[in-house]
Interface confidence: medium
């Protein structure tokens, strides 16, 4: 697909543009903003806490252009990349290079997308072709999930209730997925 590659702050080689409007979560844009969730938690010892609300993972904001064949969005969209090791929220770094990383023994904890939002984008096409409108899925919040030794990556287990702020402006989900507290949605760029 002729993806352009460049290095971001973490020196990872990544695609700038993709066929589908969501690059894999591990691929970060060069315009990232690191933020640790749920600061100011009560000071429990990280290795003794049983309160799952103590656990969280990093959310990186990144911007990218949406492409569809030769067409590209007029403006970049902003979404989240779920990144980093899940652990006690108070130990997650507030900025790159600060804070301590905590790694649990036993099961693997992964930071993965939790909620999505839909956003309409206007795609501009070359050669005088009419602009196209597309609705894209964007990651709106992340959560920790537990991957047991006996399961592959498609069988991630919910790690309790996510340590996250309530999501704004969202109706309760009618389907019987567990109701979770969710982070505020990213503002639409349009």
């Amino acid at each position: 697909q002729g993806w352009q590659a460049f290095k971001n702050d973490a020196t990872e080689i990544i695609p700038e543009l993709g066929e589908y409007p969501e690059p894999p979560p591990e691929l970060e844009n060069n315009k990232t903003m690191n933020r640790a969730e749920n600061g100011g938690r009560p000071p429990h010892h990280p290795f003794e806490t049983k309160d799952v609300s103590e656990y969280s993972c990093r959310e990186l904001h990144f911007t990218r252009y949406v492409t569809d064949g030769p067409c590209r969005s007029a403006k970049p969209v902003t979404e989240l990349v779920c990144s980093g090791q899940c652990g006690p929220a108070r130990l997650l770094p507030n900025a790159i290079g600060r804070g301590k990383w905590w790694r649990p023994s036993g099961p693997d904890f992964r930071c993965i997308p939790d909620r999505y939002r839909a956003q309409r984008v206007q795609l501009l096409c070359p050669g005088g072709e009419a602009p196209r409108a597309r609705k894209v899925r964007l990651v709106a919040s992340c959560k920790c999930k537990r991957l047991t030794r006996f399961h592959n990556q498609s069988e991630l287990k919910d790690f309790g209730t996510e340590a996250a702020r309530p999501q704004k402006g969202r109706k309760p989900r009618p389907r019987a997925r567990s109701a979770k507290a969710n982070q505020a949605e990213l503002e639409n760029a349009y």
């Epitope: 690059p23 997308p113 999505y116 969202r170 109706k171 009618p174 997925r177």
Partner: antibody, heavy 117, light 111 residues
């Protein structure tokens, strides 16, 4: 051209298991969400499950949650559906579909799963 | 559960226009403004006919068009032809997980 080819369907007894596969070609597999959609004989389409590009996010219809597991192998360009504790009401043609821009732009030809004793 | 409601059947004569409706709750069609339509002939896989309310994929006849008003989306087929006889399904996505949901389907009979 984009192609999705399902396999693995067949006759299975209630309570049994089956694993469906969907081999994809003609597009950048790892750049797309994928879904399984089923259709019981003489009935309408029912979305079953979907999975994001790297397999880290998976979602299921209430009717199959806890029994079915969707997964993918991007190195093999293959989508899977592991079906356990099968019931008679799971009898259907199962389609894999490419889930692009929140609609299904390409579908496989389907594979029939029959759950009967 | 969220549901999209379609009429079970519609019919029309060759050359006529018909409209199939798809009504949903505010958490799918009404709020999200994104409805797709699929055509399915007996024994065949569904085929995408309309996406994002009113967009046609390349290769789909311009006799097919989509629209939406409030929480009801509509598929209109003008100049009905015999080969249009098929089942038609609307589809949207629901909730903050953006999982997919289909209407119950409408059987179109060309008289």
């Amino acid at each position: 051209q984009v192609q999705l080819v399902e396999s693995g369907g067949g006759l299975v007894q209630p309570g049994g298991s089956l694993r469906l596969s969907c081999a994809a070609s003609g597009f950048t597999f790892r750049s797309h969400w994928l879904s399984w959609v089923r259709q019981a004989p003489g009935k309408g389409l029912e979305w079953v499950s979907n999975i994001n590009y790297d397999g880290s996010s998976t979602y299921y219809a209430d009717s199959v949650k806890g029994r079915f597991t969707i997964s993918r192998d991007n190195s093999k360009n293959t989508l899977y559906l592991q079906m356990n504790s099968l019931r008679a009401e799971d009898t259907a043609v199962y389609y894999c579909a490419r889930d692009t821009y929140l609609h299904f732009d390409y579908w496989g030809q389907g594979t029939l799963v029959t759950v009967s004793s | 559960d969220i549901a999209l409601t379609q009429p079970a059947s519609v019919s029309g004569s060759p050359g006529q226009s018909i409209t199939i409706s798809c009504t949903g709750t505010s958490s799918d069609v009404g709020d999200i403004n994104d409805v797709s339509w699929y055509q399915q002939h007996p024994g065949k896989a569904p085929k995408l006919m309309i996406y994002d309310v009113n967009n046609r994929p390349s290769g789909v006849s311009n006799r097919f068009s989509g629209s939406k008003s409030g929480n009801t989306a509509s598929l209109t087929i003008s100049g009905l032809q015999a080969e249009d006889e098929a089942d038609y399904y609307c589809q949207s996505y629901a909730g903050s997980y953006l999982s997919e949901v289909f209407g119950g389907g409408t059987k179109l009979t060309v008289l």
